[in-house]
């Protein structure tokens, strides 16, 4: 009788095993092993037992021990089962961004691995099992469909193989694919809202705001703002599911005309765009020209207002005659005209909008100095020891400097409260002086002595 030990072996692919072939008779004519595997006999004492080292076991095999005894020939098989983990565990590639609400098919492919009866394929979201199936076919393929939800954003999907050899006294061998990180997104069907000036003046700055609600995840949204070929650099502020992109736009004379303003929002693999037109115009403020901004009293002054050729002007509220870009007025400068403003208002129509520009110039009329009876009385009579405030006001532009001296030495304290004494009495020469010249006026102070009964 031929026997083999062990009768069943599970070993890793490429491994080695010692197989003992025994026979029940003492002097067998023949004792050996039949196998395609490389073998090496280990020398043992006795004739009824042989030990072989079988090496480089690549696949399941059934080596057969045989013996030829006087009572006949017999055989015994040992069952070698080779185990190995899959060579490839892979999730079929998918776009990383997936819109919420879409059915996403996850497909796992497994190449190799044995014994297949012990090999299971598991699809996972994070640590949660979505599907578990035995590995069937080469390559084995397991699929499942997932309805993409907002809370799946950032989730890792993976595929795991489990080679469970615990019943065979070994362990559980796991292989996991590279994870697929799902980026979910919501991009509403409504285009972004674009708020901008419809018209913009050359060499000025305008503000453009592009906003959109109902986005997820809002922080991943890309906003592209452009005016013609000019890419704008917006400052983006985010809400829970909304953003607002604000950009400053500067335009030059080269941009004059109608330009396309675009706001594109890109999220995931989708985009929404809004277009608007902006008219860029040049409209300098009207020019107010005074023959001279500073004139002496009595000088003839011409005030001209000139504006953009297509503008219509009014000068100090009076429209140009005929209505057009030029207006003028003539006047003889008087002191009352000092500080008078000449305002020119120009109106230009741009893309259906009326644009208004103003320019104001002030006329300075130099006059005086003046010292007259009303503001600088020539005679004061005050009781001795009374409190009085000598008043003398000089007029003119520029405002004159005023001094009143008696005998070229003693000043009259203009605008100050003084106690009237005999010293105050006398004739003072008041002089008012400015760049326009000087005027003089005599002021007499009389002091009344108290009467004693």
């Amino acid at each position: 009788q031929t026997s083999v030990s062990p009768s069943k072996v599970i070993l890793p692919r490429g491994g080695s095993v010692l197989v003992t072939c025994s026979t029940s008779c003492d002097q067998p004519k023949l004792l050996g092993i039949e196998t395609p595997l490389p073998k090496k006999e280990l020398l043992l004492p006795g004739n009824n037992r042989k030990v072989y080292e079988l090496s480089n076991v690549q696949e399941d095999s059934q080596p057969m021990c045989y013996s030829n005894c006087p009572d006949g020939q017999s055989t015994a098989k040992t069952f070698l089962t080779v185990y190995w983990t899959p060579e490839r565990v892979e999730l079929a590639p998918l776009p990383s961004w997936q819109p919420v609400g879409k059915n996403l098919t996850l497909r796992c492919q497994v190449e190799g691995g044995a014994p297949r009866a012990n090999l299971t394929v598991v699809l996972l979201r994070g640590e949660k099992e979505l599907k578990r199936e035995p590995a069937v076919g080469e390559p084995a393929e397991v699929t499942t469909t997932v309805l993409v939800r907002r809370d799946h954003h950032g989730a890792n999907f993976s595929c795991r193989t489990e080679l469970d050899l615990r019943p065979q006294g070994l362990e559980l061998f796991e292989n996991t694919s590279a994870p697929y990180q799902l980026q979910t997104f919501v991009l509403p069907a409504t285009p972004p809202q674009l708020v901008s000036p419809r018209v913009l003046e050359v060499d000025t700055q305008g503000t453009v705001v592009c906003s959109l609600d109902g986005l997820f995840p809002v922080s991943e949204a890309q906003v592209h703002l452009a005016l013609g070929d000019q890419r704008l650099n917006p400052t983006v502020t985010y809400g829970n599911d909304s953003f607002s992109a604000k950009a400053s736009v500067s335009v030059t004379a080269e941009d004059e005309g109608t330009q396309r303003l675009t706001c594109a929002v890109i999220l995931g693999n989708q985009s929404q765009e809004t277009l608007q037109t902006v008219t860029i115009y040049s409209f300098p403020a009207p020019n107010v020209i005074l023959t001279k901004p500073e004139v002496s009293e009595g000088t003839e002054v011409t005030v001209k207002c000139e504006a953009h050729p297509r503008a219509k002007v009014t000068l100090n509220g009076v429209p140009a005659q005929p209505l057009g870009p030029r207006a003028q007025l003539l006047l003889k400068a008087t002191p009352e005209d000092n500080g008078r403003s000449f305002s020119c208002s120009a109106t230009l129509e741009v893309a259906g909008q009326l644009i208004h520009k103003n320019q104001t110039r002030e006329l300075r009329v130099l006059y005086g100095p003046r010292l007259d009876e009303r503001d600088c009385p020539g005679n004061w009579t005050w009781p001795e020891n009374s409190q009085q405030t000598p008043m003398c006001q000089a007029w003119g532009n520029p405002l004159p400097e005023l001094k009143c001296l008696k005998d070229g030495t003693f000043p009259l304290p203009i605008g100050e409260s003084v106690t009237v004494t005999r010293d105050l009495e006398g004739t003072y020469l008041c002089r008012a002086r400015s760049t326009q010249g000087e005027v003089t006026r005599k002021v007499t102070v009389n002091v009344l002595s108290p009467r004693y009964e």
Partner: antibody, heavy 123, light 107 residues
Framework: QMQLVQSGGGVVQPGRSLRLSCAAS????????MHWVRQAPGKGLEWVAV????????YYADSVKGRFTISRDNSKNTLYLQMNSLRAEDTAVYYC????????????????WGQGTMVTVSS | DIVMTQSPSSLSASVGDSVTITCRAS??????LAWYQQKPGKAPKLLIF???TLQSGVPSRFSGSGSGTDFALTISSLQPEDVASYYC?????????FGPGTQVDIK
């Protein structure tokens, strides 16, 4: 009554120096701008220099700039003219004179004059 | 600098005559003009300032006029004591230039 009394004139050789003084009395000297005016023999009046009431601003005629220095000592009620590098053409009667009024930013006509002092520059 | 010119350089008139001396500035000096009288060996004396204002103590026969660049000093009735040199002076800014003077004599 106000008075300006001058001293310091005399005969001096070309290239030498001389200092004229002008003492004021009967007026608030420190309130007024003061001037020097000269008159060459048989000629007209020539303004020479001015100093503001507090001594902060000084101006000179081009003919004396860099050679003459005007100064004042308000505590002594005295005006000075330091004349250096004297030339024959500096020969003249030198008068000190007071601004009529004590204006803030400008000078005035001259209402009081000193009696004059003769400076002769001769070798 | 502003240049002051006077004319005539000298004049002779009879007692009681009205005489006029003119003074011209090379630029506008408004009415910043003074007139001085100088008798031989004496310091000048202020007659008129602000072109037309008579200094205290000066006889009313003296009067001044003008503004801008052209000015005049008039002695309405010439007196023997009026024999002197007369100078105009501009005083709006330094240098406070004098005119060359006009010598007035009695015929």
């Amino acid at each position: 009554q106000m008075q300006l009394v001058q001293s310091g004139g005399g005969v001096v050789q070309p290239g030498r120096s001389l200092r004229l003084s002008c003492a004021a009395s009967g007026l608030t000297f420190s309130s007024y701008g003061m001037h020097w005016v000269r008159q060459a023999p048989g000629k007209g009046l020539e303004w020479v220099a001015v100093i503001s009431y507090d001594g902060s601003n000084k101006y000179y005629a081009d003919s004396v700039k860099g050679r003459f220095t005007i100064s004042r000592d308000n505590s002594k009620n005295t005006l000075y003219l330091q004349m250096n590098s004297l030339r024959a053409e500096d020969t003249a009667v030198y008068y000190c004179a007071k601004d009529f009024y004590n204006w803030n930013d400008w000078h005035d006509a001259f209402d009081i004059w000193g009696q004059g002092t003769m400076v002769t520059v001769s070798s | 600098d502003i240049v002051m010119t006077q004319s005539p350089s000298s004049l002779s008139a009879s007692v009681g005559d009205s005489v006029t001396i003119t003074c011209r500035a090379s630029q506008d000096i408004s009415n910043y003009l003074a007139w001085y009288q100088q008798k031989p060996g004496k310091a000048p004396k202020l007659l008129i300032f602000a072109a037309s204002t008579l200094q205290s103590g000066v006889p009313s026969r003296f009067s001044g006029s003008g503004s801008g660049t052209d000015f005049a000093l008039t002695i309405s009735s010439l007196q023997p004591e009026d024999v002197a040199s007369y100078y105009c002076q501009k005083y709006n800014h330094v240098p406070q230039t004098f005119g060359p003077g006009t010598q007035v004599d009695i015929k």
